[in-house]
Amino acid sequence: EVEKTACPSGKKAREIDESLIFYKKWELEACVDAALLATQMDRVNAIPFTYEQLDVLKHKLDELYPQGYPESVIQHLGYLFLKMSPEDIRKWNVTSLETLKALLEVNKGHEMSPQVATLIDRFVKGRGQLDKDTLDTLTAFYPGYLCSLSPEELSSVPPSSIWAVRPQDLDTCDPRQLDVLYPKARLAFQNMNGSEYFVKIQSFLGGAPTEDLKALSQQNVSMDLATFMKLRTDAVLPLTVAEVQKLLGPHVEGLKAEERHRPVRDWILRQRQDDLDTLGLGLQG
């Protein structure tokens, strides 16, 4: 807490400008009006304030808005956002995607902090669902964002938003998350033709059931081994040797290199040796 002291004569701030960097902490507290600061927040980022000076500015805003900052101030917080705690952010009501983008820009290049996680949570809850524009924005800043959500949170993602998802956004998703996302993707891409559909659905297939894999095996999709290795064990095990051969096409030879790894290992154990021998790969059940 900065002590309440009178502002020295002639030092009362008329606007937020470079001259304030020479003010001591107590002078900033005494001489900068909180309402002026709130209306000129956009100028703060252009001024090289020290961390200690930013603490004073934050303190002034906290006093002015004890129930939480208005969005007009939040949008222009800039580097002052890094001074906010998750508790501060929980008081906010952020509705504009532009505000969200502005604050994410401040944290760009860093891992998702608790502050950013809280901000995103407040924003998404305020919107009621994870719409396409929001998902586009969040995955652009944090490619792993989607996989940081619980299956319950993912259930609020509308199928239309799935179009915004890139393969790399799913890299760290676990099977339970893909179980939720796959049916949405199937719905989103249902009107595409065979080859285009497979390109889009491929990265979601870790959530696909056996019957969908069987259907794909009839479409000459030539699934690569990396995708096959991410399929659910319970979805792969019922597939016949012929179905796996059709599903993988020319990539079937890759099974040999993966024979010690799941789910290939479990699938091999399930097959009759005579059937495995038809592949000519030397796989032993």
Epitope: D174, L237, R260, R262, Q284
Partner: antibody, heavy 119, light 107 residues
Framework: QVQLQESGPGLVKPSETLSLTCTVS??????????WSWIRQPPGKGLEWIGY???????NYNPSLKSRVTISVDTSKNQFSLKLSSVTAADTAVYYC???????????WGQGTMVTVSS | DIQMTQSPSSLSASVGDRVTITCRAS??????LNWYQQKPGKAPKLLIY???SLQSGVPSRFSGSGSGTDFTLTISSLQPEDFATYYC?????????FGGGTKVEIK
């Protein structure tokens, strides 16, 4: 529900063969969804997987023990067994048998049996 | 062999604490990672399978996350019965391997 019970001698002499049997009750060793494993734990140390067997007789062993280990299955008796040859004091441990369900993991364990290697 | 490295090897915590244990694989194991709890003189008990799925009968305060090489077991609010040793285990490669264990002790 499925239960596992280890049996075998608690004391084995150095250079001899350690033999243990695991009896499966309440379920079948011929289940297509399960592998049957042996795992051991030396006193005060961590867990070490020894190997598994599938009902078909297909096996897989820990590379560090492979030359000394044999796991077999007897579907008629609903049992699987472990043989570890040329034992030394370093093989002294609690030996567990466990079911490895392909969809989950080692979801059912025996209570473990302490085997001491000493002359 | 795939090496599994757990950290910390031991930790002291109080009832009600949030506890996090990490497990790192020497190469990608997809989501084929299980967590076990073991109490002295008892066989291990499966808590989490496939990195994040809660085994039937296990309290919801236990949760798992991760994929690839980095995994986490979290106990949201430590209970007296949770003081034990925890092990991670990979089943991706046919040569199964366990982590070295993390002993959770009372502070």
């Amino acid at each position: 529900q499925v239960q596992l019970q280890e049996s075998g001698p608690g004391l084995v002499k150095p250079s001899e063969t350690l033999s243990l049997t695991c009896t499966v009750s309440g379920g079948s060793v011929s289940s297509r969804d399960d592998l049957w494993s042996w795992i051991r734990q030396p006193p005060g140390k961590g867990l070490e997987w020894i190997g598994y067997i599938y009902y078909s007789g297909s096996t897989n062993y820990n590379p560090s023990l492979k030359s000394r280990v044999t796991i077999s299955v007897d579907t008629s008796k609903n049992q699987f067994s472990l043989k570890l040859s040329s034992v030394t004091a370093a093989d002294t441990a609690v030996y567990y048998c466990a079911r490895d369900n392909v969809f989950t993991g080692f979801d059912i364990w025996g209570q473990g049996t302490m085997v001491t290697v000493s002359s | 062999d795939i090496q599994m490295t757990q950290s910390p090897s031991s930790l002291s915590a109080s009832v009600g604490d949030r506890v996090t244990i990490t497990c790192r694989a020497s190469q990608s194991i997809s989501s084929y990672l299980n967590w076990y709890q073991q109490k002295p003189g008892k066989a291990p008990k499966l808590l989490i399978y496939a990195a994040s799925s809660l085994q039937s009968g296990v309290p919801s305060r236990f949760s798992g996350s991760g994929s690839g090489t980095d995994f986490t077991l979290t106990i949201s609010s430590l209970q007296p019965e949770d003081f034990a040793t925890y092990y991670c285990q990979q089943s991706y490669d046919a040569s199964y391997t366990f982590g070295g264990g993390t002993k959770v002790e009372i502070k």
